[in-house]
């Protein structure tokens, strides 16, 4: 662990109450193939415990979705991954809209610091799938 | 190699016979930019040779595809990556549908064990592109 | 740095003149969350300084885009990442079309050599978003 190989792969636990766009995550071998090795969960949000550059990746699939589900909505459903606390470091890291599709997936490299909490905000009125092969979120420490 | 840096990037060889949804992969410098360094191919399917957490990634593009070719299907074309053997460890790791699009691409972290064979199942009646910059599949060992 | 942990994450600077499909990138902490640690920029194009296998990733979002923007174009908007110099090593590594969507995102493992310059060509008449959470391009050295 001293090498700094912090890594986590999370599965969706639940969505927030109506005015809270955040997705709430869970992880651990008892739940399936999700795990936390270094980072930790704080009320369903991922908190970083080691400074460094991380590869952040996410896939979110909308539940019982067809291309008409997403295209008929006036305000497109959007997923944003960002640092939500501490407030001084708040920033959007990754943003995608679903448009005619039902799944978004992306990844990026970004510097993160100990104590950064990552939030994944799903705006719109469609629900994310809780299937563990359709919706997941992870980070991997790659270098100091 | 003793560091456990197992890694592979594969290109599409061919699809299976009609009732076999699996994609068959190939790799090696003679074929282009694909390679196998640690993992191996067993009849076109990728077999893991070292325990650990892996980053699995895939991109599949449908052949001569326009948005009309996929939207007219009421059975959407779907790509699933999973462990298909040993049977005791069979599970779907990653699943995406094409919906109105012609390409899916995603990645995830997952624990894999020596002997796990990964299958990539493309269900539907569209062919995957064999262009090496449009369709590829790879794994990267990232930590024990 | 002697470990060979070359890594870069870039944000879009600008597009080229009309007959130049290349995207021009920039990186550095002063610009936001982009950085170059090993690779370098040559007139907005990313140049590799260390041989090895790299994970290349990209996300490009089209500016002020809706699914009708992309679907109404006869020639689909396409993004290709490739080695553009030296000419002897020129090859397309990664290619995606937008079709009905407004964002493409993918990643792949590929061998790169010192001196390889990577170009990202966006063909079509739609402009990429310059928002740093919507359009980015990066590489990560993963093994020799």
């Amino acid at each position: 662990e001293s090498l700094g190989w912090d890594i986590a792969e999370l599965q969706l636990n639940h969505t927030g109450p109506q005015q809270d766009p955040r997705l709430y995550w869970q992880g651990g071998p008892a739940l399936g193939r999700s795990f936390l090795r270094g980072p930790e969960l704080d009320k369903g949000q991922l908190r970083i415990r080691r400074d460094g550059i991380y590869m952040v990746h996410i896939q979110v699939t909308l539940a019982i979705c067809s291309s008409t589900s997403t295209s008929r909505h006036h305000h497109p459903t959007t997923l944003a991954v960002g640092i939500c606390s501490p407030a001084s470091r708040s920033i959007s890291l990754l943003r995608l809209s679903f448009h005619q599709g039902c799944t978004i997936a992306s990844q990026r490299l970004t510097p993160l610091a100990r104590g950064d909490t990552l939030c994944t905000n799903l705006t719109g009125t469609l629900l994310p799938s809780r299937n563990t092969d359709e919706t997941f979120f992870g980070v991997q420490w790659v270098r100091p | 190699e003793s560091l456990g840096w197992d890694i592979a990037e594969l290109q599409l060889n061919h699809t299976g016979p009609q009732q076999d949804p699996r994609l068959y992969w190939q790799g090696g410098p003679a074929l282009g930019r694909s390679f196998l360094r640690g993992p191996e191919l067993d009849k076109g399917q990728l077999r893991i040779r070292r325990d650990g957490i892996y980053m699995v990634h895939i991109q599949v593009t449908l052949a001569i595809c326009s948005s009309t070719s996929t939207s007219r299907h009421h059975h959407p074309t779907t790509l699933a990556v999973g462990i298909c053997s040993p049977a005791s460890r069979s599970i779907s790791l990653l699943r995406l549908s094409f919906h109105q699009g012609c390409t899916i691409a995603s990645q995830r972290l997952t624990p894999l064990a020596r002997g796990d064979t990964l299958c990539t199942n493309l269900t539907g009646t569209l062919l995957p592109s064999r262009n090496t910059d449009e369709t590829f599949f790879g794994v990267q060992w990232v930590r024990p | 740095e002697s470990l060979g942990w070359d890594i870069a994450e870039l944000q879009l600077n600008h597009t080229g003149p009309q007959q130049d499909p290349r995207l021009y990138w920039q990186g550095g902490p002063a610009l936001g969350r982009s950085f170059l640690r090993g690779p370098e920029l040559d007139k907005g194009q990313l140049r590799i300084r260390r041989d090895g296998i790299y994970m290349v990733h990209i996300q490009v979002t089209l500016a002020i885009c809706s699914s009708t923007s992309t679907s109404r174009h006869h020639h689909p908007t396409t993004l290709a990442v490739g080695i553009c110099s030296p000419a002897s090593r020129s090859i397309s590594l990664l290619r995606l079309s937008f079709h009905q969507g407004c964002t493409i995102a993918s990643q792949r493992l590929t061998p790169l050599a010192r001196g390889d310059t990577l170009c990202t060509n966006l063909t079509g008449t739609l402009l990429p978003s310059r928002n740093t959470d919507e359009t980015f391009f990066g590489v990560q050295w993963v093994r020799p």
Epitope: - | A63, I64, H74, L126 | -
Partner: antibody, heavy 120, light 111 residues
Framework: EVQLQQSGPELVKPGASVKMSCKAS????????IHWVKQKPGQGLEWIGY????????KYNEKFKGKATLTSDKSSSTAYMELSSLTSEDSAVYYC?????????????WGQGTLVTVSA | DIVLTQSPASLAVSLGQRATISCRAS??????????IHWYQQKPRQAPKLLIY???NLESGVPARFSGSGSGTDFTLNIHPVEEEDAATYYC?????????FGGGTKLEIK
């Protein structure tokens, strides 16, 4: 066994219209696109267009836009082609055809053809 | 539209010999790693029958004496050894884009 059974021959006057049918059996009708192909006597084959019975999605060869109209009736697993404003150039055998396993425009199963003769 | 030109227009081949039919496309019909050319056999007063798809794949139930080859713009259908029942007109067809088009046909006669 897949079968495409086409309606019988038609003798029609110039300027009139004709509607021919193609009844499918041996498979799920809404799963497969139906294509239509024209063959003039002693000549080659010309693609007219296709219809997907699931959602009535159609595509036409530019040459046949305004000439051919493709429709279907899911309840009877039947595809139809109507030809309008007929001239002697429309005298031909018209085939319906089903794609093969893969959803691209090559044709694994064919009807027996409907002969249309346009004559005053 | 892509134009397919077949040659020869007709040929006569002795029983047991090889028949070679050519098809040339006005532009490449290769894309996505496949060659989008297909071959059909048509006998008088019958519908066409698919023999070969994607340039070289034998359709189920078609005898192995039929084979297809080629890429880009030049394609060949070979029949060897030719049998009596192979007397027919043969057509190539592309599905690279819409509209699919057919070659003009090659009439094979058995000597």
């Amino acid at each position: 066994e897949v079968q495409l059974q086409q309606s019988g021959p038609e003798l029609v006057k110039p300027g009139a219209s004709v509607k021919m049918s193609c009844k499918a059996s041996g498979y799920t009708f809404t799963d497969y696109v139906i294509h239509w192909v024209k063959q003039k006597p002693g000549q080659g084959l010309e693609w007219i267009g296709y219809l997907h019975p699931y959602n009535d999605d159609t595509k036409y060869n530019e040459k046949f836009k305004g000439k051919a109209t493709l429709t279907s009736d899911k309840s009877s697993s039947t595809a139809y082609m109507e030809l309008s404003s007929l001239t002697s150039e429309d005298s031909a055998v018209y085939y319906c055809a089903r794609r093969g396993y893969y959803d691209y425009a090559w044709f694994a199963d064919w009807g027996q053809g409907t002969l249309v003769t346009v004559s005053a | 539209d892509i134009v397919l030109t077949q040659s020869p227009a007709s040929l006569a081949v002795s029983l047991g010999q090889r028949a070679t039919i050519s098809c040339r496309a006005s532009k490449s019909v290769s894309a996505s790693g496949y060659t989008w050319i297909h071959w059909y056999q048509q006998k008088p007063r019958q519908a066409p029958k698919l023999l070969i798809y994607l340039a070289s794949n034998l359709e189920s139930g078609v005898p192995a004496r039929f084979s297809g080859s080629g890429s880009g713009t030049d394609f060949t259908l070979n029949i060897h050894p030719v049998e009596e029942e192979d007397a027919a007109t043969y057509y190539c067809q592309h599905s690279r884009e819409l509209p699919p088009t057919f070659g003009g046909g090659t009439k094979l006669e058995i000597k």
